[in-house]
Interface confidence: low
């Protein structure tokens, strides 16, 4: 129903704590360079205003839309043009154009320093002094680096962070309690970020229909006992929630997500037998739990899919009379039978089925034409299955770091024009798929691998869009989202690339590398590896292995030497010479 004051309505629904957290996330995602203090001040002003509207919905400006209220706040920030350049031009526009303008200026790769975690003692001190400010800093720092992070889920991660600190700061050895737990939350949050960015890309580039198809497939896999009407309702609601979050309407998004969780818990009987554990939890944990709940047991008596979609003589009539509904039921029926497939694969199969009906239903004998459609799915299914087997075998042989290096070589050869930092980031993320997915049971590997790779490649596309340099990447990123991963997999060495000339300074290292954390050391070595491939794109795996082994040996020797600086300055040039010779 319509409310006299939208801001009062959301404040009442969400409660002060969540309201403030979401407003802080919204401001941090829009204006990514502002300090925490600047945003905290705005949040307090907005919250105070919301309270006046709760007290009197007819008070001045309480009837204004949230976009108008928030936009006016952002546009009142001093020195907006000096700090944000052309983003300040958005403030000359009226709603809804102004909000659209803000959205277009969100930066997926802001030039902010990495989010460094303070050491345990310092963290615990500031957490104990002021938990609210501490968590506010966390929300602000994550949100500004990830401008499309799913806001209600970020509140969940902040809650996790809070619980870990409460527990570990009471321990004697704070460091060893905090580190593994916070690393776990960080890893999950980063995966959540790329997954949500993929959803927003789907919504932005291909509209609600594309996202809804994704949701139907995903929900049908998870809830195979729910009927199509139920799945359609859930998919519609989930699409609305994601549309709101991707559009910056974070209060509405969080409110509607809570409503959806409530609906699911009140209708478990018609949705799934696996929801009770989630439904017993408090709000943020409940919604998070529902989003990754295990698949329900598939009904035992499901008839063959062919009965309705191939053998039925009325297929073309059913298709013609209600295309979206008919294709929707196909996607539902196929997905509920295949929890072992990735959503991307299911959408490719639905697309193939649609194309087949478009072609066959215009022919003289449609059943003869579409009769083989299920057999034609086979190559589409085999391709990702082979990808999983090949890559998981390689991961098991090389381990995560070695697997990342193999991917780095592969992708640098496919798109050598892409900047080295982007290639290294992509390869490291793609390489984590091994640890994340290859250890899972066989039937869970394919959905895990392909849907994760698709999300990472979406980030590659977003970064490449800012500065397009590779025709290969442009080609793969221009197609539909579900075809991206197969497109990237099919790329071979870019024959148009003119190799980079060898620069000794690229491969010159100093003793400061010895004190870097292991992760930073790996990044330095992987940066060198990418540069080697850019210099010799057709170097064999054997040649590259020789050089990298030599390089690792050099680092090990010099970092153990009594006089590290001398070792690096004398042995370094020898290493460079040996590298050139090995690749000649």
């Amino acid at each position: 129903e319509a409310h006299k004051s939208e801001i009062a309505h959301r404040y009442n629904d969400l409660g002060e704590q969540h309201f403030k957290g979401l407003v802080l996330i919204a401001f941090s995602q829009y204006l990514q360079k502002c300090s925490y203090d600047e945003h905290a001040k705005l949040v307090q002003e907005v919250t105070d205003f919301a309270k006046t509207c709760v007290a009197d919905e007819s008070a001045a400006n309480c009837d204004k839309s949230l976009h108008t209220l928030f936009g006016d706040k952002l546009c009142a920030i001093p020195n907006l043009r000096e700090n944000y350049g052309e983003l300040a031009d958005c403030c000359t526009k009226q709603e809804p154009e102004r909000n659209e303008c803000f959205l277009q200026h969100k930066d997926d790769n802001p030039s902010l320093p990495p989010f460094e975690r303070p050491e345990a003692e310092a963290m615990c001190t500031s957490f104990k002094e002021n938990p609210t400010t501490f968590m506010g800093h966390y929300l602000h720092e994550v949100a500004r680096r990830h401008p499309y992070f799913y806001a209600p889920e970020l509140l969940y991660y902040a809650e996790q962070y809070n619980e870990i600190l409460t527990q570990c700061c009471a321990e004697a050895d704070k460091e060893s309690c905090l580190t593994p737990k916070l690393d776990g939350v960080k890893e999950k949050a980063l995966v959540s970020s790329v997954r949500q960015r993929m959803k927003c890309s789907s919504m932005q580039k291909f509209g609600e229909r594309a996202f809804k198809a994704w949701a139907v497939a995903r929900l049908s896999q998870t809830f195979p006992n729910a009927d199509f009407a139920e799945i359609t309702k859930l998919a519609t609601d989930l699409t609305k929630v994601n549309k709101e979050c991707c559009h910056g309407d974070l209060l509405e998004c969080a409110d509607d997500r809570a409503e959806l969780a409530k609906y699911m818990c009140e209708n478990q009987a018609t949705i799934s037998s696996k929801l009770q554990t989630c439904c017993d939890k408090p709000l943020l944990k409940k919604a998070h739990c529902l989003s990754e709940v295990e698949h329900d047991t598939m009904p035992a008596d499901l008839p063959a899919i062919a009965a309705d979609f191939v053998e039925d003589q009325e297929v073309c009539k059913n298709y013609a009379e209600a295309k979206d509904v008919f294709l929707g039921t196909f996607l539902y029926e196929y997905s509920r039978r295949h929890p072992d497939y990735s959503v991307s694969l299911l959408l490719r199969l639905a697309k193939k089925y649609e194309a087949t009906l478009e072609k066959c239903c215009a022919e003289a004998n449609p059943p003869a034409c579409y009769g083989t459609v299920l057999a034609e799915f086979q190559p589409l299914v085999e391709e990702p299955k082979n990808l999983v087997k090949t890559n998981c075998d390689l991961y098991e042989k090389l381990g995560e770091y070695g697997f990342q290096n193999a991917i780095l070589v592969r992708y640098t050869q496919k798109a050598p024009q892409v900047s080295t930092p982007t290639l290294v980031e992509a390869a490291r993320n793609l390489g984590r798929v091994g640890t994340k997915c290859c250890t899972l049971p066989e039937d869970q590997r394919l959905p895990c691998v392909e849907d994760y790779l698709s999300a990472i490649l979406n980030r590659v596309c977003l970064l490449h869009e800012k500065t397009p340099v590779s025709e290969h990447v442009t080609k793969c990123c221009s197609g539909s989202l579900v075809e991206r991963r197969p497109c990237f997999s099919a790329l071979t060495v870019d024959e148009t690339y003119v190799p980079k000339e060898f620069k000794a300074e690229t491969f010159t290292f100093h003793s400061d590398i010895c004190t870097l954390p292991e992760k930073e050391k790996q990044i330095k070595k992987q940066t060198a590896l990418a540069e080697l491939v850019k210099h010799k794109p057709k170097a064999t795996a054997e040649q590259l292995k020789t050089v990298m082994d030599d390089f690792a040996q050099f680092l090990d020797t010099c970092c153990k030497a009594a006089d590290k600086d001398t070792c690096f300055s004398t042995e370094g040039p020898n290493l460079v010479t040996r590298c050139k010779d090995a690749l000649a």
Partner: nanobody
Framework: EVQLLESGGGLVQPGGSLRLSCAAS????????VAWFRQAPGKEREFVAG????????YYADSVKGRFTISRDNSKNTLYLQMNSLRPEDTAVYYC???????????????????WGQGTLVTVSS
């Protein structure tokens, strides 16, 4: 389990009208794809009209399009078939059928419906 019970059949003159009802129990009628079929003496059972579950999209056999209207009343858990401009060739036993938990679209293939009513006879004659 879904139980279906048809009513409303009878004798009617050509050009006349009849309204058939099908009361469902055991499952909500809006959650399942439902359809009307008919069987004339000595002939195969044929699809007449259907309506999707959760999606109010209707389907009709070419022979009844424009004359028959399928609808449902969710509050009464009942399916209807409004038959106008009746012809002698519409004479048959009319059956109501349901297919829950399958695609929520109607199929025109009788074998795909697990639940059936006992039928109601419609005779069109002068």
């Amino acid at each position: 389990e879904v139980q279906l019970l048809e009513s409303g059949g009878g004798l009617v003159q050509p050009g006349g009208s009849l309204r058939l009802s099908c009361a469902a129990s055991g499952r909500y009628i809006d959650e399942t794809a439902v359809a009307w079929f008919r069987q004339a003496p000595g002939k195969e059972r044929e699809f007449v009209a259907g309506i999707g579950g959760g999606v109010d999209i209707t389907y009709y056999a070419d022979s009844v399009k424009g004359r028959f209207t399928i609808s449902r009343d969710n509050s009464k858990n009942t399916l209807y078939l409004q038959m106008n401009s009746l012809r002698p060739e519409d004479t048959a036993v009319y059956y109501c059928a349901a297919r829950p938990g399958r695609p929520q679209i109607t199929s025109k293939v009788a074998d795909l419906y697990p639940y059936w009513g006992q039928g109601t006879l419609v005779t069109v004659s002068s």
